[in-house]
């Protein structure tokens, strides 16, 4: 997260760290007791490493009573996701067992009504991604409030030049932005999960290159079918 600040500890109990061989790789969001939603591209970076999900964490390194690392029973990328595009960049991870819920571990309601968030709406994005252009990684969860950007502006040639489909949304990126390592994490508007950070190799913090988020409402049928 660029231009953000440390999150209040455990105030986002849905927040997950998707890890490979014990290292944070991507963000994720607990959407059901045994399921974490993330970005499909995160799996590509995992190679053949052991994928696990950390829940109940604020600090990645310090011991915390609520922290628990779960093995992944099943990884389900969206069937239409492709390495060379950010389309359908969603991944569902089934935990090896149901998460132990509590004040620091709780699923987040996700948007089912397929309607665009009003441009200008302030939404919260959180993650353990880099906090500087130099690539500094935080130990503790960071967050930032970002205004939603209308799709027409996001599709301008100087922004994303027509690449933003109706199944994506954009948020402003003027120094405050999601960045590398935040992919798969949640964009939360009004207490509801609206978007998942896409995992393209986008420049961060440049206002002409807005953050791109996969709209979960557009994938309600797929999410329901996997969780069923």
């Amino acid at each position: 997260i660029l231009g953000g600040r440390e999150a209040e500890a455990h105030a986002r109990p849905y927040m997950a760290s998707v890890q490979v061989n014990g290292e944070h790789l991507c963000g994720g969001v607990l959407v059901a007791e045994q399921w974490v939603l993330s970005a499909a591209h995160c799996l590509e970076d995992a190679a053949d490493g052991k994928v696990q999900v950390l829940l109940g964490a604020h600090s990645l390194s310090q011991p915390e009573p609520s922290k628990r690392l779960y093995d992944v029973l099943r990884a389900v990328p969206h069937p239409d996701s492709r390495p060379d595009t950010i389309d359908h960049d969603l991944l569902l991870l089934q935990l090896s067992e149901k998460a132990t819920l509590g004040p620091a571990v709780r699923p987040l309601p996700w948007q089912r009504v397929d309607r665009d968030v009003e441009p200008g709406t302030l939404c919260d994005v959180a993650g353990w991604g880099i906090v500087s252009h130099a690539g500094r990684r935080p130990d503790r969860l960071q967050h930032v409030l970002l205004p939603v950007l209308d799709r027409a502006t996001c599709n301008r040639r100087t922004h994303h030049d027509g690449a933003i489909t109706q199944r994506m949304m954009c948020a402003e990126s003027n120094r405050r932005d999601s960045c590398k390592g935040d992919s798969g994490g949640p964009l939360v508007c009004g207490g509801v999960l609206e978007g998942v950070v896409t995992s393209g190799s986008r420049v961060c913090g440049n206002r002409k290159k807005p953050g791109i988020y996969t709209r979960v409402a557009s994938y309600a049928a797929w999410i329901d079918s996997v969780l069923a």
Epitope: N155, Q166, K208
Partner: antibody, heavy 116, light 112 residues
Framework: EVQLVESGGGLVQPGGSLRLSCAAS????????INWVRQAPGKGLEWIGD????????DYNADFKRRFTFSLDTSKSTAYLQMSSLRAEDTAVYYC?????????WGQGTLVTVSS | DIQLTQSPSSLSASVGDRVTITCRSS???????????LEWYQQKPGKAPNLLIR???NRFSGVPSRFSGSGSGTDFTLTISSLQPEDFATYYC?????????FGQGTKVEIK
């Protein structure tokens, strides 16, 4: 299939007004800016300006700001170019074009002739 | 406003010829985001322009590989490696980096 269709061109007297329409289909109208470009007979392309179909924000080439106005009817997926105080040098084919990707999609153009 | 000057204004060539059109901008057209929004369009008489090249050198989908773009800063080139009968048209460069966006005056490619 993305389509832009202009209409409203024709013969108009100097000092007169005209409203051109650009009807969009095959995509969600509010997802892309509409730009207007004109081309005088035998001449090059000239950018008039653009409009954001969700916010209504506009940007005009300074040469056209006083006499030309953009508007929208999103329920009809249509953009409009209102032209006033027309003069002979405004005689041109007027195009609308969608921005994104680049100017990949254009209308067929509509000819405006300003003459007495 | 940024001026784009194309040369030559017109040229005569034969099928199979290699054709090069240049476009020079009055100032740099590198955008603040680091990208250069220099595009090339082809226009045939009575028709709307067709997008050929985006961001200096990226061919738009469906554009034949004989069309290529290059350049940086203020000097840009469109090359047609082997001119085909359907390539006789007018070509325009365009900059979208700075408002007002502007077109070059055009280069007409005619049959020799």
């Amino acid at each position: 299939e993305v389509q832009l269709v202009e209409s409203g061109g024709g013969l108009v007297q100097p000092g007169g007004s005209l409203r051109l329409s650009c009807a969009a289909s095959g995509y969600t109208f509010t997802d892309y800016y509409i730009n207007w470009v004109r081309q005088a007979p035998g001449k090059g392309l000239e950018w008039i300006g653009d409009i954001n179909p969700i916010t209504g924000d506009t940007d005009y080439n300074a040469d056209f700001k006083r006499r030309f106005t953009f508007s929208l009817d999103t329920s009809k997926s249509t953009a409009y170019l209102q032209m006033s105080s027309l003069r002979a040098e405004d005689t041109a084919v007027y195009y609308c074009t969608r921005e994104g990707p680049s100017f990949a999609y254009w209308g067929q153009g509509t000819l405006v002739t300003v003459s007495s | 406003d940024i001026q784009l000057t194309q040369s030559p204004s017109s040229l005569s060539a034969s099928v199979g010829d290699r054709v090069t059109i240049t476009c020079r901008s009055s100032q740099t057209i590198v955008h603040s985001n680091g990208d250069t929004y220099l595009e090339w369009y082809q226009q045939k008489p009575g028709k709307a322009p067709n997008l050929l090249i985006r961001k200096v050198s990226n061919r738009f989908s469906g554009v034949p590989s004989r069309f290529s773009g290059s350049g940086s800063g203020t000097d840009f080139t469109l090359t047609i490696s082997s001119l085909q009968p359907e390539d006789f048209a007018t070509y325009y460069c365009f900059q979208g980096s700075h408002v007002p966006v502007t077109f070059g005056q055009g280069t007409k490619v005619e049959i020799k």
